[in-house]
Every structure is written in C-alpha cells, then in structure tokens.
Interface confidence: medium
C-alpha cells in the first residue's frame, strides 16, 4: 500500500508511517516502527508537557522566585505548569506574572484611569485622539494636546498618543 502523506489526529508522520503522539504528561522515548508502538515515558517530578506531543524533553515547571515577590498560586502537575502570583499587596507586571510591582505603571500612550489602592492595581487606559502620555507612570493621566490656536500658532507636527503636537509660527506670507 501507498505510504501515508497525512496522519489522524494525535498521530505524527515519520519514516513514511503514522505513529501515535505521546499523551500530555509524557515525553517521547522512541518512535514507533512497523512492529512496535511509540514509546513514551512520564515527565519527572518538576516537569510537564501540556499537549499531545513528540517532545524528547519535558518542560521545567516555572519557578516562583520569592526574590521577585512571587509565590505559588497553583502547583504544577505532569500536565500543567506551575502558576505564580504575587505576595499580598503586590501585583503582576504581566499576565504571565514573571515579576511583581507595588502598583503597575501605564506605558507611554496610556494614562492612569484609576490610581492603585491597597487592594486593586493601577487601571490604565489608552490615550484617545487629542491626548498623549510620553512617560511610564503609575499616576499620570493622558494630557490633552497643546492647542496651537490659542497661542496664535499653527500645528507644525501632528500629535500622537505618545507625543504632543508641535506648534510653530503662522506663515505670514499668506494673503
């Protein structure tokens, strides 16, 4: 029979034949042959694999480093990674929670909608058209663009969400 060009779900193609993938929590030891099944082994104590796979090494569980203010929220299993969270009163800097801050700063282009409290982190909002923020800050709101007209000037460079407009003198040559 013709060798397969594609395999079923939870299988992979190798040496012109379809082998079973290893289930989550197990790694590949050896590919299947005409006569033998795929050989898989469970991941070790501090390791995991979270998908059907053909990986020869399991991934290490994430380390929740107390020096970064992290602690374990949910212990990893052979099929899931460890989930870290921050110590009481601290907040994750990202969804992956790789480090902690007392309160998060809003990046340039974003302003503070609500300053952090003891229990809630800073709430940031994108600066709308007509406003900008050029700093990373845990406190500053978006600032309105400078109004060139009120200074009897004209816009020389348009503003963005991260920069103010640049005003310049009116062109006196106009009739």
């Amino acid at each position: 029979p013709e060798p397969p060009t594609a395999c079923r779900e939870k299988q992979y193609l190798i040496n012109s034949q379809c082998c079973s993938l290893c289930q989550p929590g197990q790694k590949l030891v050896s590919d299947c042959t005409e006569f033998t099944e795929t050989e898989c082994l469970p991941c070790g104590e501090s390791e995991f694999l979270d998908t059907w796979n053909r990986e020869t090494h399991c991934h290490q569980h994430k380390y929740c480093d107390p020096n970064l203010g992290l602690r374990v929220q949910q212990k990893g299993t052979s099929e899931t990674d460890t989930i870290c969270t921050c110590e009481e009163g601290w907040h994750c800097t990202s969804e992956a929670c790789e480090s902690c801050v007392l309160h998060r700063s809003c990046s340039p282009g974003f302003g503070v909608k609500q300053i952090a409290t003891g229990v809630s982190d800073t709430i940031c909002e994108p600066c709308p058209v007509g406003f900008f923020s050029n700093v990373s800050s845990a406190f500053e709101k978006c600032h309105p663009w400078t109004s060139c007209e009120t200074k009897d000037l004209v816009v020389q460079q348009a503003g963005t969400n991260k920069t103010d407009v640049v005003c310049g003198p009116q062109d006196r040559l106009r009739a």
């Epitope: 020096n67 480090s99 007392l102 800050s137 845990a138 406190f139």
Partner: nanobody, 116 residues
Amino acid sequence: EVQLLESGGGLVQPGGSLRLSCAASGFTFEWYEMQWVRRAPGKGLEWVSAISGDGYRTYYADSVKGRFTISRDNSKNTLYLQMNSLRAEDTAVYYCAKELAFFDYWGRGTLVTVSS
C-alpha cells in the same frame, strides 16, 4: 550603580514634624517618578507618596493627605518628605524608591517612631 540613601528619621512626639531626605545617585534622577513607601512593624509595605520627574505633580495615599508633602530638588538629586501632624500610626521604616518593582531600586530605609 543605582544608590538611594534615606535620612532624617528619628523619635518624635505625636503632632510633631520630621523631614526625610533621600539622596540618589547612579541614574538620571529627573527622568524618574520617585516614591516614598513605608513598612509599619509587622505589616506589609504601604505606598505613601509619589512625585513626577519634573516635580510638578504629586500624589498621596489617603492616610497622609494634607499632612505630608513630597518634593524634590533635581539639581541636588534629592527627594524629600515633609511630615507634619505625625501620629502613632505613622511609625514605620520609610523607604524612597525609584521604581515600585519588588526587585528594583530601593533605599535601606529610615526609621520614624512617633511616641510620647
């Protein structure tokens, strides 16, 4: 190397005043928002106050609003906290901080004790 050195703490009676200073070095001081944070005995860290890099905008925790004043002198790379009408609950180690990240740049702190 970034360094922050607080001073000005001490023992003061309720209702008294103190002025804390924080001498900064190793970074471009005026580029950064600076903060005061405190840790009361047996408690977690509490954010106290912050000031924008240019010194024009200031922010305070409700617990100190109207009593504490944050300021900075960018020509001297120094941050200040003027503390008036001190209360027993203001007793804490006060830290100045360049950033509020857990692992980032903090001073060693200065102890303020409010007691009669």
